[in-house]
Amino acid sequence: GPVWRKHYITYRINNYTPDMNREDVDYAIRKAFQVWSNVTPLKFSKINTGMADILVVFARGAHGDFHAFDGKGGILAHAFGPGSGIGGDAHFDEDEFWTTHSGGTNLFLTAVHEIGHSLGLGHSSDPKAVMFPTYKYVDINTFRLSADDIRGIQSLYGDPKENQRLPNPDNSEPALCDPNLSFDAVTTVGNKIFFFKDRFFWLKVSERPKTSVNLISSLWPTLPSGIEAAYEIEARNQVFLFKDDKYWLISNLRPEPNYPKSIHSFGFPNFVKKIDAAVFNPRFYRTYFFVDNQYWRYDERRQMMDPGYPKLITKNFQGIGPKIDAVFYSKNKYYYFFQGSNQFEYDFLLQRITKTLKSNSWFGC
């Protein structure tokens, strides 16, 4: 199922139930999000205006989706899995009597369950799990997620120690030699390697220890921060940069006009909303696009996807996956795959990992 592809997630309370004080609603919702942030790398922040990832709504009857509420009892609430628009939103039936305690329906407990759905969890068959489909009051002061809930959410997002790998909320320059440093995208550009992270990129000139940090906007003012994938076709002096469902073409280090364009022009199906990583192999003249736990192969000569894709990363790149953050091609036989703070040198002729490194090993740390 879908997951959020970022770790900083915003929520907004669209309206308040008259059953409770506003502060109690705010507190119940905040604590419900905290239950999930305590066991994952996710960070939640409340916003009061604008488009949030997760919209919390109290409504009765028909309320703008295909799932009208049914009056008191029955369906208490529902939530949509991660995605744009209605994706992630949590709806609470206003015909219930929402409370901070055991009377009526406890908002905190219901919200923990619904936020689980908002994050991509389905129902659990374990009656002790908060994701079990039926509501049962438990003491909120001693409430704990079950092992099944934790297993489920960590299978989607990992555990909290991955917090250190996240983009800085203040967008300050990441510490280059932080052992937990991860990258958003990596690509060669001629004899240099570009490492992208948030608003920044590091430039590594091959075989030289010195690296310099730059703002992406200082080199390419028209490009966004948070580049998610990148690859180079050196013979054409072209670099492709990807963010969300758009890509930019850089020729001879200059952005081409009439970009960005949609990634769907490569032939991706509509459900692909972003690219995690990409790499061009000049030997085969093919580009590999990594999306979630799958990859596509694109024929750069014929300008079309090869048939038979997508394929599972783990099936065809032994020891890599299920997902990757970045990848680049080097020395005519290696892919360097980045997964969080780890990096894997992968010999594509032998089809195996030949070295495991830290992601920032290129910087003499």
Partner: antibody, heavy 122, light 103 residues
Framework: EVQLLESGGGLVQPGGSLRLSCAAS????????MSWVRQAPGKGLEWVSR????????GYADSVKGRFTISRDNSKNTLYLQMNSLRAEDTAVYYC???????????????WGRGTLVTVSS | DIQMTQSPSSLSASVGDRVTITCRAN??????LNWYQQKPGKAPELLIY???SLQSGVPSRFSGSGSGTDFTLTISSLQPEDFATYYC?????FGQGTKLEIK
């Protein structure tokens, strides 16, 4: 490439029955909500029915409730609409539409078929 | 029940014009509103979802705005291929449509 191809339309007498099919390809059919939407000649769009990915959850417009039944066969990548007790006002082009979402449906249709014409007349 | 009222029902404009179509719900639908374009004899095509998000492949001259009960679709500079009928939609409810014709 996502493709939806409706079939089964035609001329039928009032009170008669018809079964529409929609063959889907180019996406994982069993992951998505699907809907039928119709358009009477010269009129606007009217949502008719929807079905969840597993087929366990369905919904209908009031105008067809009790007369139409939506179903799907995920092994055949096919969506169906069984239409009984047809009336003149059911005359329309019937479109099969793919919802952008699995699980709960927000009713956002990113792909549509070309439609099949159903004419109810004596 | 939720109802959607679209206006105007028809509109004449020229190539290069800026055009606005509005859609009003009788109760809040948050940002759960979509816009479709339909050309004669063709199936509808998704233009805008979640009130303001542009569907991939749709030209940037199309934009959407609004939340709650009032929504607008704007075409910043009409092109010949934009003459069509436009529908707003929320779950199982469509607006009546706006036919955009050449002046």
């Amino acid at each position: 490439e996502v493709q939806l191809l409706e079939s089964g339309g035609g001329l039928v007498q009032p009170g008669g029955s018809l079964r529409l099919s929609c063959a889907a390809s180019g996406f994982t059919f069993s992951w998505y909500n699907m809907s039928w939407v119709r358009q009477a000649p010269g009129k606007g769009l009217e949502w008719v029915s929807r079905i969840s990915p597993s087929g366990g959850d369905t919904g209908y417009a009031d105008s067809v409730k009790g007369r139409f039944t939506i179903s799907r066969d995920n092994s055949k990548n096919t969506l169906y609409l069984q239409m009984n007790s047809l009336r003149a006002e059911d005359t329309a082009v019937y479109y099969c539409a793919k919802d952008i979402r699995g699980a709960y449906s927000g009713g956002l249709f990113d792909y549509w078929g070309r439609g099949t014409l159903v004419t109810v007349s004596s | 029940d939720i109802q959607m009222t679209q206006s105007p029902s028809s509109l004449s404009a020229s190539v290069g014009d800026r055009v606005t179509i509005t859609c009003r719900a009788n109760q809040s639908i948050y940002t759960y509103l979509n816009w479709y374009q339909q050309k004669p004899g063709k199936a509808p095509e998704l233009l805008i979802y979640a009130a303001s998000s542009l569907q991939s492949g749709v030209p940037s001259r199309f934009s959407g705005s609004g939340s709650g009960t009032d929504f607008t679709l704007t075409i910043s500079s009409l092109q010949p291929e934009d003459f069509a009928t436009y529908y707003c939609q929320q779950a199982g409810i469509f607006g009546q449509g706006t036919k955009l014709e050449i002046k």
